[in-house]
């Protein structure tokens, strides 16, 4: 996360990270008590190596009495998503079991409406991407709010030029932004989960850029045919 | 095998319900959510809803939210789907159908009820 | 809602004919779309899934294909049996819709 904050410890229980041999490779959200929600493309990185998933975690090195690592029983990437493309930029993983829930494991509510968010409203981002240009990674979760922008503006031939389809939105990204290992994480508008954070290679926190969030609501018959 | 069995055929009055039954066997009855589907003579499908057995959760096409309500029995492996102010417009056969498959992912189709036929007439 | 245009309503065929069905999505599904056979007093029957994928038992005659929003199934060689109508549907999203069916005959 780029120009944000650290975020308050535990605030937000739905918050995973995926981590590969025990390094953080990207964010998650909890969904359901089995099911973390995450990017497709966060697989491609893991390569052949031990996928788990953190939760009920602040830092990601101290011990915590709420964080527990699950093992994850079945990875289920969206069919259409593709290496080249942030098209349908989605992954389910079923952990091994059920999450032990409490005051810092919840799952978090996902929008099923398929209705764009306004313009203008403010989401919360959460990650432990990095949070500097140099690459800095924190230890503690990190948070910042963005203004939805509007499809049209961030489709802009200036902007992402017509790649951002009606199954994508974008947050403003002027010098506060996602970045890199924030992938997969949350983007949280009035208590609902609207967006998944993409995992495209795209530059951080240039307002010309704007961050590209996958929209959950376009995809509800997929992750409900999954999580049935 | 996996089967639904559905309800016979039923006629009705304007105005008034029906209640229709699918009875699952051949597989534990909370493993799948369970959909119907709606075909009116020489036309096409219309998705009506689910009904995930194991939690109750209904999801309901909104054109049909106020016209139908699902419900299911895990006692007796059974769902059932209520129709409620009837019209000429719900005459249809209405079948109940279920996703077995292997990749666990996406609303397709792979086990259908026989259907049951709605003929509202006064 | 998305639409699923099934443009033709019948379509004459000779058996040991290859013949194409088409349906067109009014919007992006992706690949998130099945084809259904459905004879005469009959419930529909799984053909394909995930628009390239035979159902368990499909005769590989059966085949699915698709370029952008135009799904195709390609039936080769068409059989007696074969005769029937044949539905697409998208469960990309809610609500799940169908095409309104193409009616194979023979010539």
């Known amino acids: 996360i780029l120009g944000g904050r650290e975020a308050e410890a535990h605030a937000r229980p739905y918050m995973a990270s995926v981590q590969v041999n025990g390094e953080h490779l990207c964010g998650g959200v909890l969904v359901a008590e089995q099911w973390v929600l995450s990017a497709a493309h966060c697989l491609e990185d893991a390569a052949d190596g031990k996928v788990q998933v953190l939760l009920g975690a602040h830092s990601l090195s101290q011990p915590e009495p709420s964080k527990r690592l699950y093992d994850v029983l079945r990875a289920v990437p969206h069919p259409d998503s593709r290496p080249d493309t942030i098209d349908h930029d989605l992954l389910l993983l079923q952990l091994s079991e059920k999450a032990t829930l409490g005051p810092a494991v919840r799952p978090l509510p996902w929008q099923r409406v398929d209705r764009d968010v306004e313009p203008g409203t403010l989401c919360d981002v959460a990650g432990w991407g990095i949070v500097s240009h140099a690459g800095r990674r924190p230890d503690r979760l990190q948070h910042v709010l963005l203004p939805v922008l509007d499809r049209a503006t961030c489709n802009r031939r200036t902007h992402h030029d017509g790649a951002i389809t009606q199954r994508m939105m974008c947050a403003e990204s002027n010098r506060r932004d996602s970045c890199k290992g924030d992938s997969g994480g949350p983007l949280v508008c009035g208590g609902v989960l609207e967006g998944v954070v993409t995992s495209g290679s795209r530059v951080c926190g240039n307002r010309k850029k704007p961050g590209i969030y996958t929209r959950v609501a376009s995809y509800a018959a997929w992750i409900d045919s999954v999580l049935a | 095998q996996v089967q639904l069995q559905q309800s016979g055929a039923e006629l009705a009055r304007p105005g008034a319900s029906v209640k229709m039954s699918c009875k699952a066997s051949?597989?534990?009855?909370?493993?799948?959510?369970i959909h119907w589907v709606k075909q009116r003579p020489g036309q096409g499908l219309e998705w009506i809803g689910y009904?995930?057995?194991?939690?109750?959760?209904?999801n309901y096409n909104q054109n049909f939210a106020d016209k139908a309500t699902l419900t299911a029995d895990r006692s007796s492996s059974t769902a059932y789907m209520q129709l409620s102010s009837l019209t000429s417009e719900e005459s249809a056969v209405y079948y109940c159908?279920?996703?077995?498959?292997?990749?666990?992912?996406?609303?397709?189709?792979?086990?259908w009820g026989a259907g049951t036929t709605v003929t509202v007439s006064s | 809602d998305i639409v699923m245009t099934q443009s033709h309503k019948f379509l004459s065929t000779s058996l040991g004919d290859r013949v194409s069905i088409t349906c067109k999505a009014s919007?992006?599904?992706?690949?998130?779309v099945a084809w259904y056979q459905q004879k005469p007093g009959q419930s529909p029957d799984l053909l394909i899934y995930?628009?390239?994928t035979r159902h368990t038992g499909v005769p590989d005659r059966f085949t699915g294909s698709r370029s952008g929003t135009d799904f195709t199934l390609t039936i080769s060689n068409v059989q007696s049996g074969d005769l029937a109508d044949y539905f697409c549907?998208?469960?990309?999203?809610?609500?799940?819709?169908f095409g309104g069916g193409t009616k194979l005959e023979i010539k």
């Open positions: 159908a279920i996703r077995l498959g292997y990749d666990r992912q996406g609303w397709y189709f792979d086990v």
């Open positions: 051949g597989y534990t009855f909370t493993t799948y959510t």
């Open positions: 009904i995930n057995p194991s939690s109750d959760f209904t």
């Open positions: 919007q992006d599904v992706g690949s998130a």
């Open positions: 995930w628009t390239f």
């Open positions: 549907q998208q469960y990309s999203n809610y609500p799940l819709t």
